[in-house]
Interface confidence: medium
Amino acid sequence: NKILVKQSPMLVAYDNAVNLSCKYSYNLFSREFRASLHKGLDSAVEVCVVYGNYSQQLQVYSKTGFNCDGKLGNESVTFYLQNLYVNQTDIYFCKIEVMYPPPYLDNEKSNGTIIHVKGKHLCPSPLFPGPSKP
């Protein structure tokens, strides 16, 4: 039996920050679980981890240096990513593992979310169009 995961197909990070919600076909209340967010088609980079147990005190960390946080809903985990770089535009996959109570459960691979990080480009002011041609 596998948990199904729903994610937005695409998100745009305009201010180098984005909230990605992972929705599960499973209620995480009073469960010991490990929710994680992975970057790349091969999910090679573990961006952020949210670990929860019955006390409902979440442990959140990124061993890959991302600025991330997480919030828990009954059937969802929302990852908050900040200080993203343009070159971190990629596809991101939600993963969930339920360790307790038995049986161990994990998810079918989701379709992922493309996070498009928009850089902050300085635009020339229309008040100063530059030198005009004679």
């Epitope: 979440l58 442990q59 959140v60 960390y61 990124s62 061993k63 890959t64 240096g65 991302f66 600025n67 991330c68 946080d69 997480g70 919030k71 908050y80 900040q82 200080n83």
Partner: nanobody, 123 residues
Amino acid sequence: EVQLLESGGGLVQPGGSLRLSCAASGFTFPAYSMIWVRQAPGKGLEWVSTISPLGYSTYYADSVKGRFTISRDNSKNTLYLQMNSLRAEDTAVYYCAEQTAYLNRATEHFDYWGQGTLVTVSS
């Protein structure tokens, strides 16, 4: 090398306030939940409070709820603990730690601890 340096402790009268600071270096501070724990004289370690990496979530032990406030400034790599309405039973050495280090403190992560700062509440 990971370094955590606590400061701000001291002697305070019951009902008084203190603000503890913890300056972190040697790891990616904004990437980890951080905690305060304390050790009263002759007692074991007691968890006090946790804050998530970007400060979205905070947690407190029942014994300090409503009196202590945890916060962090990721731009300064610094963790804080504002302690109000202090009681004699708050007397302890206060330590900050990266949360995974605390949960795995029987392992090699034990180095992720500071020297602590002593808080004495007495009249």
